[in-house]
Interface confidence: low
């Protein structure tokens, strides 16, 4: 706590300007009116205050707004935002996307700090759902943001927001997250036709069920191997050799390079060797000719 001392004669600040950088900490505390600071917060960012001086300015705002800062002040915090603790931020009610952008800009280029995470959490909870504009903004600053959410949190993302998602935003998503996002993407893009639909849905296919992959195989989509390798193993296993050939199109030759990796390895083990041979890729490990294939999942369902 900075000691309360009277402001020296003639030093009372009439506005927030560069002259204040020459004030000692105690002079800032004594001579700068908190209400004046609040109304001229936008000027603070342009003045090269030291970290110690910023601590004093924060303290003054804390005293003026013990229940949390109003949005008019928050929007202009600038570098002072870096001085805020998650506890400070939990008191805020941020509703404007412009405010969110302004604060994210301050932290741009850095890892998502606890302060930023708290800010985003407050903002999204305040809005009730992760709408398209918010998602657009958050993924622009933090491409991995979407994949940092739990499947439960992702379930509140409306399908309309999926339009804001870029392929790189899904790079770090795990299968459980894609399981939640894929049906939303399917709904969002349902009115698109063949090739455009595939372009948009491609990044989400790690959550696609077998029947959707079968449907795609009939649409001349030419899926690349990188996408195929991210598909759910349980969704790939029931696909026939003919369906995989149609799904991959000219990329089918890439299966040879991936034959030891999942899901290709597991898929090969489920196919008749005769059928694999029709691809002419030299894939080995299929079910030998003359062997009976039992569908154990069907047997379990019947018992």
């Amino acid at each position: 706590e900075v000691e309360k001392t009277a402001c020296p004669s003639g030093k009372k600040a009439r506005e927030i300007d560069e002259s204040l950088i020459f004030y000692k900490k105690w002079e800032l505390e004594a001579c700068v009116d908190a209400a004046l600071l609040a109304t001229q917060m936008d000027r603070v960012n342009a003045i090269p205050f030291t970290y110690e001086q910023l601590d004093v300015l924060k303290h003054k705002l804390d005293e003026l707004y013990p229940q949390g800062y109003p949005e008019s002040v928050i929007q202009h915090l600038g570098y002072l935002f870096l001085k805020m603790s998650p506890e400070d931020i939990r008191k805020w009610n941020v509703t404007s996307l412009e405010t969110l952008k302004a604060l994210l800009e301050v932290n741009k280029g850095h890892e998502m700090s606890p302060q930023v995470a708290t800010l985003i959490d407050r903002f999204v909870k305040g809005r009730g759902q992760l709408d398209k504009d918010t998602l657009d903004t958050l993924t622009a600053f933090y491409p991995g943001y979407l994949c940092s959410l739990s499947p439960e949190e992702l379930s509140s993302v409306p399908p309309s927001s999926i339009w804001a998602v870029r392929p790189q935003d899904l790079d770090t998503c795990d299968p459980r997250q894609l399981d939640v996002l894929y049906p939303k993407a399917r709904l969002a893009f349902q009115n698109m036709n063949g090739s455009e639909y595939f372009v948009k849905i491609q990044s989400f296919l790690g959550g696609a069920p077998t029947e959707d992959l079968k449907a795609l195989s009939q649409q001349n989509v030419s899926m690349d191997l990188a996408t195929f390798m991210k598909l759910r193993t349980d969704a790939v296993l029931p696909l026939t050799v003919a369906e995989v050939q149609k799904l991959l199109g000219p990329h089918v030759e890439g299966l040879k390079a991936e034959e030891r990796h999942r899901p290709v390895r597991d898929w090969i083990l489920r196919q008749r060797q005769d059928d694999l041979d029709t691809l002419g890729l030299g894939l080995q490990g299929g079910i030998p000719n003359g062997y009976l294939v039992l569908d154990l999942s069907m047997q379990e369902a019947l018992s």
Partner: antibody, heavy 120, light 109 residues
Framework: QLQLQESGPGLVKPSETLSLTCTVS??????????WGWIRQPPGKGLEWIGS???????FYSPSLKSRLQISVDTSKKQFSLKLSSVTAADTAVYYC????????????WGQGTLVTVSS | EIVMTQSPATLSVSPGERATLSCRAS??????LAWYLQKPGQAPRLLIY???TRATGIPARFSGSGSGTEFTLTISSLQSEDFAVYYC???????????FGQGTKLEIK
Amino acid sequence: QLQLQESGPGLVKPSETLSLTCTVSGGSISSSSYYWGWIRQPPGKGLEWIGSVYYSGSAFYSPSLKSRLQISVDTSKKQFSLKLSSVTAADTAVYYCARRPYKSGLFDFWGQGTLVTVSS
Amino acid sequence: EIVMTQSPATLSVSPGERATLSCRASQSVSSNLAWYLQKPGQAPRLLIYGTSTRATGIPARFSGSGSGTEFTLTISSLQSEDFAVYYCQQYNTWPPEYTFGQGTKLEIK
């Protein structure tokens, strides 16, 4: 080095069909990364997007021209084509073919354009 | 459709000076805006996309800014080869319905 070359008649009679072809060289028309589009520019005026086609044949058309327009692709010939029916003098323009990345609607590479005049 | 309006229609600036061209959209196009340059008898050439990203080979004197409905193209120090017609184009709509501005002619003062 990618090149786009428009070809077709420079003069078309009113009520007939305007047909143009764009030949792609120095790059693959079958790339899944691009659409191939047509844009036109009436003499002394601004640019107007006509439509775009994907290598699979999937096409999108300008709503104002949709009823008269057909855009197709022939990957074996490395060409895509424009057919605009029932033309009038208002369709007189320089017609450009262009490439657009499938993830956005900008046009990053253009042909040099061909003037088509509609007149009897 | 989204209407793109460019201003001014003609801009007269001396070589070496700064030029500022404006483009306004009738509704928000987010940051999905491109700028093109067109010289007489030539095809347009992509300058800027995504509001502010310079296309390959475009000099640093060209910069774009804005978002939503108001956009600006700035040429910091005009060279003789920069005098041409400039078009803005939005590509925000789905299904695709791309629209261009009517153009700004940049001429030598």
